[in-house]
């Protein structure tokens, strides 16, 4: 689940929790003890920005080699640069690790644009600002790549946090998080708070500022406001969910809900944009255009090919609508909605011409592989990947960018019937036909 469109930071602006904390329902309490509360050592352990990905510091090998690793909930391989590359400041040197074990097997991962390939092995891995454990994990040592590493992104590898079903070369390669849970007492859940800056960051600002938090094994109350609402994980491959309704400024898009999930809907921290199936994208843009019709924007802007700029501090946020996605709830016929602001879907970018303007790229784009709820969505929310209970939780992030008039929201319950019908069933390919 790599960049381009797949694959900006809280830096002293806003971000204070809004409103009052609501009492939690007893139903929300975890089954395992110690899964909630404060995880001080893990708060603020991410850096980066939505356009280039968020990364966590990890160590591999003995003695430990420190690397920055992209956090990607849209893939399932732990893969690190293991050979010199013009965009890498450092890379994993297997020959220097006394605990490296070669699996004598290669792996090749092509993307729509670009690819990486490497050699499989295992080694000892830990997360300095994570749980105080060391695990033996599978590592793909990337020896060759094309359009994978990003110049200036400051990460040297990728941590695929999804399920074994989509691991390469096949589902027998245990993903990192599975190894972590099996080998330690870390509960089978993690949560992400990705913090967009609301303005573009240069290299030194990214390094100096916080990008968010990955809480491994728990939920930290300080990272969200209000209540957590959960949607079922439909199938354990990607983090697949079901969208049951879409509104632009409260106006229903009125599409058959199957269209919203054609051919799937996933939560993917390794994708920059909110990506929507072609029909849904066209309907959404039409509705957003109508809502912001006080001024015509060129087609190139809506296609992400042009930037829009305003004199610094004068961006007319109010002319852009809020976007609400209704997600299937945990209770029959119950849904909840997550609402993002233009501050999330207009992504700050540097002006090529002058620094006197605030410039943005439209960060909603078209997809041929279903809905992808990328950083644009995730930057509004604290997202709990509760693998133990096969569900994903959303709450308003304490660091989301907003203004004095509107805030991102997570609200419910709403009555929604026949939500199961919204899921699309991907036809199963007969594996044997692929062998010829």
């Amino acid at each position: 689940t790599q960049h381009g469109i797949r694959l900006p930071l809280r830096s002293g602006l806003g971000g204070a929790p809004l409103g009052l904390r609501l009492p939690r329902e007893t139903d929300e309490e975890p089954e395992e003890p110690g899964r909630r509360g404060s995880f001080v050592e893990m708060v603020d352990n991410l850096r980066g920005k939505s356009g280039q990905g968020y990364y966590v510091e990890m160590t591999v090998g003995s003695p430990p080699q420190t690397l920055n690793i992209l956090v990607d909930t849209g893939s399932s391989n732990f893969a690190v640069g293991a050979a010199p590359h013009p965009f890498l400041h450092r890379y994993y040197q297997r020959q220097l690790s006394s605990t490296y074990r070669d699996l004598r097997k290669g792996v090749y991962v092509p993307y729509t644009q670009g690819k990486w390939e490497g050699e499989l092995g295992t080694d000892l891995v830990s997360i300095p600002h994570g749980p105080n454990v060391t695990v033996r994990a599978n590592i793909a040592a990337i020896t060759e790549s094309d359009k994978f590493f990003i110049n200036g992104s400051n990460w040297e590898g990728i941590l695929g946090l999804a399920y074994a079903e989509i691991a390469r070369p096949d589902d027998s390669l245990e993903p990192f998080f599975d190894s972590l849970v099996k080998q330690t007492h870390v509960p089978n859940l993690f949560s992400l708070q990705l913090c967009g800056a609301g303005f573009p960051l240069n290299q030194s600002e990214v390094l100096a500022s916080v990008g968010g938090s990955m809480i491994i094994g728990g939920i930290d109350h300080s990272l969200y406001t209000g209540s957590l609402w959960y949607t079922p994980i439909r199938r354990e491959w990607y983090y697949e969910v079901i969208i049951v309704r879409v509104e632009i400024n409260g106006q229903d898009l009125k599409m058959d809900c199957k269209e919203y999930n054609y051919d799937k809907s996933i939560v993917d921290s390794g994708t920059t944009n909110l990506r929507l199936p072609k029909k849904v994208f066209e309907a959404a843009v039409k509705s957003i255009k109508a809502a912001s019709s006080t001024e015509k924007f060129p087609d190139g802007f809506w296609l992400g090919e042009q930037l829009v700029c305003w004199q610094a501090g004068t961006t007319p946020w109010n002319i852009f609508p809020v976007i609400s996605l209704y997600l299937m709830g945990e209770v029959t016929n119950q849904s909840f909605r997550i609402t993002i602001l233009p501050q999330q879907y207009l992504r700050p970018v540097e002006d090529v011409a002058t620094s006197q303007d605030d410039c943005y790229k439209f960060a909603i784009s078209q997809s041929s592989t279903g809905t992808v709820m990328g950083a644009v969505i995730m930057e509004g929310f604290y997202v709990v990947f509760d693998r133990a209970r096969k569900r994903i939780g959303f709450a308003v992030s304490a660091c989301h960018v907003h203004d004095e008039f509107r805030t991102a929201a997570v609200e419910g319950p709403f009555v929604t019937l026949d939500m199961e019908d919204c899921g699309y069933n991907i036809p199963q390919t007969d594996e044997s036909t692929l062998m010829t």
């Epitope: 001024e295 924007f297 042009q306 930037l307 829009v308 700029c309 002058t354």
Partner: nanobody, 121 residues
């Protein structure tokens, strides 16, 4: 929509010259600045030169005295005359335009596909 058409790139010996040009389609509110930036493999994007609608120009230090930007307002075209080229000028050169503000104060930035300039020693 703003369309940009670049031309003039190519290969040249160090010390040689090239002239890049970029033609932009008509735009209701006109263009308030046009210019060129470049990107060499593995390097950060660099703004080379800009020219505003009133004719004021700016250049990155490394090209001052060697490159000259000019424009033909009637044709919405911007040119970059590159003299005394050096191997370190090798890069893909992109034309960009920034429109003047519309009624909402919005300006739009567009960029071209880029034209390759290769300078060999």
């Amino acid at each position: 929509d703003v369309q940009l058409q670049e031309s003039g790139g190519g290969s040249v010996q160090a010390g040689g010259s090239l002239r890049l040009s970029c033609a932009a389609s008509e735009y209701t509110y006109g263009y308030c600045s046009m210019g060129w930036y470049r990107q060499a493999p593995g390097k950060e994007r660099e703004l080379v030169s800009t020219i505003t609608s009133d004719g004021s120009t700016s250049y990155v230090d490394s090209v001052k005295g060697r490159f000259t930007i000019s424009q033909d307002n009637a044709k919405n075209t911007v040119y970059l005359q590159m003299n005394s080229l050096k191997p370190e000028d090798t890069a893909k050169y992109y034309c960009y335009t920034k429109t003047c503000a519309n009624k909402l104060g919005a300006k739009f930035i567009s960029w071209g596909q880029g034209t390759q300039v290769t300078v060999s020693s």
